[in-house]
């Protein structure tokens, strides 16, 4: 396993609809054709997998149908979107990139993006 640099933004604020997007960029050390991207969430020293996708270079990023993540790839950067977020989902979201094929295998883990989610205030009843 060889190490690889990964960069991602330090902080992202989710929209009022609970959607957060960020870029994950990696320093590809060679001609990888198969790449796996995983988003991990770290909160209270617990790390859980949020979503993962494997893609072939030049093809679209495809997550499982029930995934809360969507994304697109362009060269050695991936644009990730996480949906359905609520205030309790606030935490550090880490981008993990693996170059699966051809060998050698490379692994890169970003420093994480702190995603802040604020639940919207319910609309007050209207008198009109």
């Amino acid at each position: 396993c060889k190490a690889m640099h990964v960069a991602q933004p330090a902080v992202v604020l989710a929209s009022s609809r609970g959607i957060a997007s960020f870029v994950c960029e990696y320093a590809s050390p060679g001609k990888a054709t198969e790449v796996r991207v995983t988003v991990l969430r770290q909160a209270d020293s617990q790390v859980t997998e949020v979503c993962a996708a494997t893609y072939m270079m030049g093809n679209e990023l495809t997550f499982l149908d029930d995934s809360i993540c969507t994304g697109t790839s362009s060269g050695n950067q991936v644009n990730l979107t996480i949906q359905g977020l609520r205030a309790m989902d606030t935490g550090l979201y880490i981008c993990k990139v693996e170059l699966m094929y051809p060998p050698p295998y490379y692994l890169g883990i970003g420093n994480g993006t702190q995603i802040y989610v604020i639940d919207p205030e319910p609309c007050p009843d209207s008198d009109f």
Partner: nanobody, 126 residues
């Protein structure tokens, strides 16, 4: 859209040095990571070096590490490849390529670059 033009190639004796330039027009190069590659007749394109947008991140394959150095001058919209201790096997056409990125990293994979120069010939011979 950015366009790239390489220069600085030519004939050099074994053990000599050359500095290649990759000049950009049509856009500011500081928005792009840049890579240098080469292709010899009958061989696959080979990665040589890359440099991130700010110049703080560079990467080289083991085959040229220590002999080749990549640098950039964003004020001149130019990226350079300094090549020392040249050998006959360094004879090839040298290309630079650019990729628009968000952060400071770069890639050594030719698959990641979407804009390429026309190339400059380097011949190492006595």
């Amino acid at each position: 859209e950015v366009q790239l033009v390489e220069s600085g190639g030519g004939l050099v004796q074994p053990g000599g040095s050359l500095r290649l330039s990759c000049a950009a027009s049509g856009d500011t190069l500081e928005s792009f990571a840049v890579g240098w590659f080469r292709q010899a007749p009958g061989k696959e394109r080979e990665e040589l070096a890359c440099i991130g947008r700010t110049g703080e991140f560079t990467d080289y394959p083991g085959s040229v590490k220590g002999r080749f150095t990549i640098s950039r001058d964003n004020s001149k919209n130019t990226v350079y490849l300094q090549m020392n201790s040249l050998r006959a096997e360094d004879t090839a056409v040298y290309y630079c390529a650019a990729e628009r990125l968000v952060f400071h990293l770069c890639s050594l994979s030719e698959y990641d670059y979407d804009t390429w120069g026309q190339g400059t010939q380097v011949t190492v011979s006595s």
